[in-house]
């Protein structure tokens, strides 16, 4: 259960399948009737530098089936993998095997999941067992976090702090797991 499911998943990578599966049809409730006006969390801005594009982070898409015990999702899901180190955007192409890695001379910058989203999945089970419905937590975006010399690997620091977030603004995708508690697990997973 929990993140153990991620580490123990029988992951099947499916090349050349770039689109998200169709979400299941809306249930009988009309969600839009119940939305907070302009609701949602504003986008997360981890960099409080003058030029936000100064640093970049690799986001690689991959597609896989998710499993829960012996059960497997009826359709594959597509998510991101946050890969490698962070560096100046101009030196860090968003693809594997091209360009040079930027090596920071100061603190170490790490590319980790920033936000997550929920996706409904139906899991088909063997032996006539009833199908299961779950909501899987998928990586939706990545960000650079800084490791300072005063903190160990599990103490990843944001470039800046976030201000209060009222439910106003653009509609973002949901968010990240705790770097403090889960960085080791994320590194194992990715």
């Amino acid at each position: 259960q929990g993140w153990q499911a991620f580490k123990n998943d029988a992951t099947e990578i499916i090349p050349e399948l770039g689109e998200y599966p169709e979400p299941p049809p809306e249930l009988e409730n009309n969600k839009t009737m119940n939305r907070a006006e302009n609701g949602g969390r504003p986008p997360h801005h981890p960099f409080e530098t003058k030029d936000v594009s100064e640093y970049s982070c690799r986001e690689l898409h991959f597609t896989r089936y998710v499993t829960d015990g012996p059960c497997r999702s009826a359709k594959p899901v597509t998510e991101l993998v946050c890969s490698g180190q962070c560096g100046p955007a101009r030196l860090l192409p968003n693809a594997i095997g091209r360009g040079k890695w930027w090596r920071p001379s100061g603190p170490d910058f790490r590319c980790i999941p920033d936000r997550y989203r929920a996706q409904r999945v139906q899991l088909l089970c063997p032996g006539g067992e009833a199908p299961r419905a779950r909501k899987v937590r998928l990586v939706a975006s990545c960000k650079c976090k800084r490791l300072t010399r005063f903190h160990n690997q599990s103490e990843l620091k944001d470039f800046g702090t976030e201000a209060a977030r009222p439910q106003k603004g653009r509609k973002p995708r949901p968010r990240a797991r705790s770097a403090k508690a889960n960085q080791a697990e994320l590194e194992n997973a990715y």
């Epitope: 949602g40 409904r120 299961r132 779950r134 937590r137 949901p174």
Partner: antibody, heavy 121, light 109 residues
Framework: EVQLVQSGAEVKKPGASVKVSCKVS????????MHWVRQAPGKGLEWMGG????????IYAQKFQGRVTMTEDTSTDTAYMELSSLRSEDTAVYYC??????????????WGQGTLVTVSS | QAVVTQEPSLTVSPGGTVTLTCGSS?????????PYWFQQKPGQAPRTLIS???DKHSWTPARFSGSLLGGKAALTLSGAQPEDEAEYYC?????????FGGGTKLTVL
């Protein structure tokens, strides 16, 4: 382990507003899907609204539309629920509840201790 | 808004088996309603027993199980204990909007 600590009991007059806070520890607020549930004395649980991670929006129960506002202060990892135009039937214990940040979304796994709001003239 | 219905009260003998059900005014309850079951004792906050129809939590005693039964969500308690006397609530997910049932008062007698 997610822990939620709510603000203390409040007594309000009809027509006033109340703002209940819910402080998150163990994780950061933005990692979690926070919901608010209330329970009037001797009555059942009633979902008021919460954050829907499928599309990154806060949804409010129809009954509370226009009267409730759910906000967050991520600098202090504190969620707030403000209910306005209070009436006597809003007297209830108000709970915040959140998921456990696992691989599968499981909502309402962790609950605050509850905040009693009494509306009386 | 949908209405979620539960038995107002049920009684079970110690060691006995009882099934609590949860229906929806909109039709049959399915796995896509992600049924939840909560236990609440007097003066305490609720605690989750079952998520997503049948998924138990680390703290859920083995004697509790969740399922779908005849178009309803069901919580079965096999081998009831005195400490299982409590109020039980189901919760259904209507596409991101949640609705609680009215609760079932379970007496172990």
């Amino acid at each position: 382990e997610v822990q939620l600590v709510q603000s203390g009991a409040e007594v309000k007059k009809p027509g006033a507003s109340v703002k209940v806070s819910c402080k998150v520890s163990g994780y950061t607020l933005t990692e979690l899907s926070m919901h608010w549930v209330r329970q009037a004395p001797g009555k059942g649980l009633e979902w008021m609204g919460g954050f829907d991670p499928e599309d990154g929006e806060t949804i409010y129960a129809q009954k509370f539309q226009g009267r409730v506002t759910m906000t967050e202060d991520t600098s202090t990892d504190t969620a707030y629920m403000e209910l306005s135009s209070l009436r006597s039937e809003d007297t209830a214990v108000y709970y915040c509840a959140t998921d456990s940040a696992g691989y599968w979304y499981k909502f309402f796994q962790h609950w605050g201790q509850g905040t009693l709001v009494t509306v009386s003239s | 808004q949908a209405v979620v219905t539960q038995e107002p009260s049920l009684t079970v003998s110690p060691g006995g088996t009882v099934t609590l059900t949860c229906g929806s005014s909109t039709g049959a309850v399915t796995i896509d309603h992600y049924p939840y079951w909560f236990q609440q004792k007097p003066g305490q906050a609720p605690r989750t027993l079952i998520s997503d129809t049948d998924d138990k939590h680390s703290w859920t005693p083995a004697r509790f199980s969740g399922s779908l039964l005849g178009g309803k969500a069901a919580l079965t308690l096999s081998g009831a204990q005195p400490e299982d006397e409590a109020e039980y609530y189901c919760l259904l997910d209507y596409g991101g909007t949640f609705v609680f049932g009215g609760g079932t008062k379970l007496t172990v007698l």
